[in-house]
């Protein structure tokens, strides 16, 4: 379960809130402190919905250790970091006669071909089907023979050369040359039943965060793939109303395992693509799960190639507190893959579940004999540990009361990682490098580059990590810069959003406060989007923007232009978010506090946060509201149904209402199984419906898309029924044929307009 992109980012690629923040001080937006003397316009709802103020991104794709591709005026340019110059790689006129709108492109690693994607049809969060054509960059022409079929589900180049693997009708095919026929790898694919090389619904959403279940070996010899069997998985069914002319609605059926239901099973195979032949079926060699997994239901949760002939697989028990990493070597004499028990690495949790959402991926050294991995240390903080494949124990190379977010690159001399160590701010992100020959030699590469403007970084490294792009996303306007790893020198500014900065000078923008409160001797962070000319002696209505799912973070240093920007700027509403128990990146003591107890502490902590905010003197405690989407909709509903008396009103969009309705992988990770022997009692007493009576004390707006494949409309339907049954008056809105994101242009505008009216009415605003 993830917050829809639109909620996190406003419109895709958009961000938020001007001005600089120094924690915990609030610096107001440039301009006069006198609100009456400020004639500048505010950031309006229309500005948000129409994306008037557009953040500029600088998207690049590294194609070597010193070159990347980027788009400019629809031309594809190649930038050479060595020489610091750009040249045209492909002119936008190249495909003028193509006859299709190109959705995406992908260059083969040897630079000889470009794969063109069109006829894009979205399926779920990551999955889609499309048509593909291949353009020969040497001959400057489209390849017309032996084309990839329409409605292809996934395509990927091999890591070197120009082999292609693709999935069509749930079966895998390989092309050795773009203009040669495909070799069929699997023959068992069947819609909604057997998936080869692609994920089913739950693996896509909750395990791999991808449609692809194919993994090329580094030199493109082997192709590893997973096969999912959903034969016994129950179907979720919902109506799709489609065009008005459709007399009978279509029924959508998706294999979707709810908590405690039958799960998909998984098998894993490797095929040698150098020995393919049209006259004989490909020989796929199975790698079976470890014995400790085969005793019960389990998941494949990570696949990482270590070398050309070594692969690591991570498996996870259905009760997600125990995982095993297998390291398997190709045995040339038998053509099999051997996974030695002596090389198995077990990862378990006694306080919760393994990993943040799943076990982290290993980062292997060049020889494949050792790897680095983020795991929980003795104190419950996630840090980098160094493993040798033949040894059980590992050596932590980082430590502290902060967490490593991700390993970004590994060279022979350094490991590069992102962490939230700097200034003890969990909501910040910076890039560090650690010397592999001396773990005490750690350098922060981003901390001091632009410390007021930039406190939240992500990074993109070139192929061998000689260069990197730093992407600063706040608290100031996003800034993209290019750097050399040789001396960590900044080479150039790629995008500084100066045009937007100039535009926003003429807007009364909110400011952002990031601070913490202490509860039971523990720091809990919050953020507040404060109206322009904020005056702490005045009373403001407050909207609590909540997510609060396990390992979530809503208090950060990211700049965003979103609905909250409008509410603060135009309606003078404080929009606050609070990271309570269950939230992430601050150690397992906080994160695992809600283990087996969803709907308890994370809900109570939002109520307590609102109480604390109302004590701050500038909050009108008669005008406190709460809203959230997805898990945030669940928490919103649980809060409003708590009878706390703190909140006047609230909005729940696409909420979970009962954990037995949500998917098995996500739900059971935190709740275990809904059986009497396990955790059925808490499943039953953590429902929104059981709190129906308390909704008489609040104003409630319930919203859901009818075609939500993720959090099913069923969940809101049951809330509605329970409220009606006890005579609660409430407001509701459905969005016909919208999924979990409610993201179509018209629905997006409608939902935010509707919610704005509701909040304004609740706060008695004109």
């Amino acid at each position: 379960m993830k917050t829809p992109w639109k909620v996190l980012l406003g419109l895709l690629g958009a961000a938020a809130l001007v001005t600089i923040i120094t924690v915990p001080v609030v610096l107001l937006n440039k301009g006069t402190d006198d609100a009456t003397a400020d004639s500048r316009k505010t950031y309006t709802l229309t500005d948000y919905l129409k994306n008037t103020y557009r953040l500029k991104l600088y998207s690049l794709r590294w194609i070597s250790d010193h070159e990347y591709l980027y788009k400019q005026e629809n031309n594809i340019l190649v930038f050479n970091a060595e020489y610091g110059n750009s040249s045209v790689f492909l002119e936008n006129s190249t495909f003028d006669e193509f006859g299709h709108s190109i959705n995406d492109y992908s260059i083969s690693p040897d630079g000889q071909f470009i794969l063109l994607e069109y006829n894009y049809v979205k399926q779920w969060r990551h999955s889609y089907t499309a048509s593909y054509d291949i353009y020969d960059l040497n001959k400057r022409q489209l390849i017309t023979e032996e084309r990839i079929p329409n409605n292809t589900q996934w395509v990927t180049w091999s890591p070197v050369g120009h082999k292609l693997a693709y999935v069509w009708n749930n079966d895998i095919y390989v092309k050795i040359e773009p203009n040669l026929p495909s070799y069929r790898i699997t023959w068992t694919g069947k819609e909604d039943i057997i998936y080869n090389g692609i994920t089913d619904w739950v693996y896509e959403e909750e395990v791999f965060s991808a449609y692809s279940a194919l993994w090329w070996s580094p030199n493109g010899t082997f192709l590893a793939y997973a096969q999912f069997n959903d034969t016994e998985v129950p179907l979720i069914e919902y109506s799709f109303y489609s065009d008005e002319s459709l007399q009978y609605p279509k029924t959508v059926r998706v294999p979707y395992p709810k908590a405690g239901a039958v799960n998909p099973t998984v098998k894993f195979f490797v095929v040698n693509t150098d020995s393919l032949s049209s006259v004989t079926n490909a020989t796929s060699i199975q790698i079976t799960a470890p014995a400790s997994m085969l005793i019960g239901d389990h998941y494949l949760c990570d696949v990482t190639w270590a070398t050309q002939e070594r692969i690591s697989l991570q498996w996870l028990r259905r009760i997600q507190n125990y995982s095993v990493m297998d390291i398997c070597d190709y045995d040339e004499s038998s053509g099999r893959w051997n996974c030695l028990v002596a090389r198995q690495h077990i990862e378990m949790s006694t306080t919760g579940w393994v990993g943040r959402f799943r076990p982290s991926e290993p980062h292997f050294t060049l020889d494949g004999n050792s790897f680095y991995k983020i795991i929980s240390n003795e104190e419950g903080y996630r840090h980098i540990c160094y493993f040798q494949i033949d040894k059980k124990d590992c050596t932590f190379i980082t430590k502290g009361t902060w967490e490593v977010i991700g390993i970004e690159a590994l060279t022979s001399d350094y490991l590069y990682y992102i962490s939230n160590e700097y200034k003890g701010m969990p909501g910040g992100r910076n890039l560090y490098k650690i010397q592999l020959s001396d773990y005490t030699k750690v350098t922060c590469l981003s901390c001091e580059l632009n410390p007021e403007r930039c406190q939240y970084y992500s990074v993109s490294f070139s192929k061998e990590a000689k260069y990197y792009q730093l992407r600063c996303s706040g608290p100031g306007l996003p800034l993209y810069t290019l750097h050399s790893s040789v001396n960590d020198k900044g080479l150039r500014v790629l995008e500084d959003n100066s045009a937007l900065d100039k535009m926003l000078q003429n807007v009364q923008m909110p400011s952002k406060k990031l601070d913490f409160i202490i509860l039971n001797e523990t720091k809990f962070w919050y953020q507040m989007i404060l109206p322009p000319h904020f005056d702490k002696s005045k009373k403001y209505p407050l909207l609590l923007d909540v997510y609060a799912g396990p390992c979530s973070q809503k208090a950060d240093t990211v700049f965003r232009l979103n609905w909250a920007t409008y509410l603060a700027s135009t309606e003078n509403i404080i929009v606050a978010s609070f990271d309570g128990r269950g939230s992430g990146y601050q150690g397992d003591k906080i994160m695992h506090a809600i283990n087996r107890r969803l709907g308890t502490f994370e809900v109570e902590d939002q109520i307590e946060a609102a109480r604390q905010f109302s004590k701050m003197g500038f909050v009108d405690n008669k005008r406190i509201a709460i809203w959230g989407w997805s898990y945030g909709g669940y928490v919103t509903s649980m809060v409003l149904g708590s009878g706390s008396g703190v909140f006047k009103c609230g909005i729940a969009v696409a909420p979970v209402s009962r954990w037995e309705y949500y998917d098995s992988v996500y739900t059971e990770r935190y709740m275990g199984l809904p059986t009497p022997e396990d955790n059925l009692d808490h499943y039953r007493n953590s429902t929104v419906m059981s709190r129906a009576e308390n909704f008489k004390q609040v104003e409630y707006l319930l919203i859901h898309g009818t075609a939500d494949d993720n959090v099913h409309f069923q969940q809101s339907a049951q809330i509605s029924k329970a409220l009606v049954d006890v005579g609660v008056d409430f407001q509701a809105m459905w969005y016909t044929d919208e999924d979990h994101g409610i993201a179509s242009s018209t629905a997006h505008q409608h939902i935010y307009t509707h919610m704005s009216h509701f909040i304004k009415q609740c706060f008695s605003l004109p």
Epitope: S277, S278, V279, D331, S333, G335
Partner: antibody
Framework: EVQLQQSGAELMKPGASVKISCKAT????????IEWVKQRPGHGLEWIGE????????HYNERFKGKATFTADTSSKTVYMQLSSLTSEDSAVYYC??????????WGQGTLVTVSA | DIPMTQTTSSLSASLGDRVTISCRAS??????LNWYQQKPDGTVKLLIY???RLHSGVPSRFSGSGSGTDYSLTISNLEQEDIATYFC?????????FGGGTKLEIK
Amino acid sequence: EVQLQQSGAELMKPGASVKISCKATGYTFSSYWIEWVKQRPGHGLEWIGEILPGIGTTHYNERFKGKATFTADTSSKTVYMQLSSLTSEDSAVYYCVRKNYDWFAYWGQGTLVTVSA
Amino acid sequence: DIPMTQTTSSLSASLGDRVTISCRASQDISNYLNWYQQKPDGTVKLLIYYTSRLHSGVPSRFSGSGSGTDYSLTISNLEQEDIATYFCQQGNTLPYTFGGGTKLEIK
């Protein structure tokens, strides 16, 4: 550079067996099929069969089942073909070939087998 | 089995000539047709695979075409080193089968 080095010429008696070797270098041995092809003067080229070293999968032309047997030794990167119950019909040049997908990409120099009383 | 027929068993041509060698399959082989060159010393080389794709290192004067059952190999500008026997082979179905060969000689 891909190379297939075949063993030398053999003079055999009728009824005997012969084992021809083909040593592969310059590529990942277990990843490619090795084909065996027979050439008799005036008879053109005849496909005997193939072996995928490592896995050891074999396919034989029906006409050579019982006549030819393929084996592979991955440690020495060598493929062997044994021909049994030799007759004058088996006198020929035998080629080992590395197959790339559906074409015979790299040919050994050939081994002449002569069957004579 | 799929018999492959090279109707011309030998062919005489002059240096610089354009030479075409044909090959017919007894049934559709879906373009899985390869051409090989065998020199008088017995050395065999792949020239063309999948009807028309030139194998690496093969001079561009060699080209292939065809579909269904009928295929041909063309040498656009005959050179001395091209004197050899040329075989076609189908790769569509097991057992693989070869044509009888076309021996190319200089006039």
